[in-house]
Interface confidence: low
Amino acid sequence: EVEKTACPSGKKAREIDESLIFYKKWELEACVDAALLATQMDRVNAIPFTYEQLDVLKHKLDELYPQGYPESVIQHLGYLFLKMSPEDIRKWNVTSLETLKALLEVNKGHEMSPQVATLIDRFVKGRGQLDKDTLDTLTAFYPGYLCSLSPEELSSVPPSSIWAVRPQDLDTCDPRQLDVLYPKARLAFQNMNGSEYFVKIQSFLGGAPTEDLKALSQQNVSMDLATFMKLRTDAVLPLTVAEVQKLLGPHVEGLKAEERHRPVRDWILRQRQDDLDTLGLGLQGGIPNGYLVLDLSMQEALS
């Protein structure tokens, strides 16, 4: 807390300018009018104030706006944003994408801080959904943003926003998140032709069901092993050897290197050894010839 002291004669600030960088903290407190500061916030970011001086300026704004800053001030906070606490930000009503961009720019190159997370949360809640422009902006600054959302939050993403998603934005998504995103992606890209569709949908396939993988196997897509290894195990298990061969195309040879890892390992255990041998890869662990395979899950469903 800065003590209240009278402003020395001749030091009263007429405007926010570079002369203030030489003011001590108590002088800033005493000589800078909060209302003047609020109207000239755009200058604060450009003037090279120290963090200590910014603390004083923040204190003045807090006194002027105890219920939270107006957006006209928020948009020009610049480096002062780094001084805000999540509690401060929860008082704000940020509706402009330009304001959001301006504040994200200040934090650019750093991890997502609690302040930024709170800001984004306030903004998205205010908008009601993650529209394409917002998602575009957020993933540009934070590629991992999408995967930081819960499946429930992701359900508010409209399919049209999926066009803004890049493959790297999904790198840290888990299967539950891809389960939500995949149907949206399928809807978003439904009017594309086969090869273009596969390029776009590929990153989302960790949420694809068996029937969609079967359909893709009929389209000569040549899925790479990295994508195959991210597929849901329960979606891969029902695929036949022929379907996996068609799905992977020339990449099928990579199965040998992955035979001890899921989902390949579990898939091998479900295939007839005879069928696996037709691949000529030396995959072992299939069902020996002459054994009868009972699908107990089907039996339970019927009883």
Epitope: N45, A46, P48, F49, T50, Y51, L54
Partner: nanobody, 118 residues
């Protein structure tokens, strides 16, 4: 240790131009702001330009806006101040200064004299 060495000062006629250079060494980070200050005889030190090395945001006070331009070359660790339309009141010792972002300017050069006179 951070060292700043200015050059380019001298005598120039009103309306003329000068380009000051500042060579920086010993920096451990690009996360620095650089500034040019000046001090006229009997007056306090005045900031005339600053630039962030990481995002190139520049700042000029009204007294030099449009006449002075600060620029940098991160690779060479150089900062420049191009001064055009010089006036008699621009006469001062010009100092190059550096600081970590949002800290006080805590590294200073020795200064270079600029005299504007006919």
């Amino acid at each position: 240790e951070v060292q700043l060495v200015e050059s380019g000062g001298g005598l120039v006629q009103p309306g003329g131009s000068l380009r000051l250079s500042c060579a920086a060494s010993g920096f451990i980070s690009n996360f620095y702001s650089m500034g040019w200050f000046r001090q006229a005889p009997g007056k306090g030190r005045e900031l005339v330009a600053s630039i962030n090395s990481f995002d190139s945001i520049t700042y000029y006070p009204d007294s030099v806006e449009g006449r002075f331009t600060i620029s940098r070359d991160n690779a060479k660790r150089m900062v420049y101040l191009q001064m055009n339309s010089l006036r008699a009141e621009d006469t001062a010792v010009y100092y190059c200064a550096a600081r970590l972002v949002r800290q006080a300017f805590n590294y200073w050069g020795q200064g270079t004299q600029v005299t504007v006179s006919s």
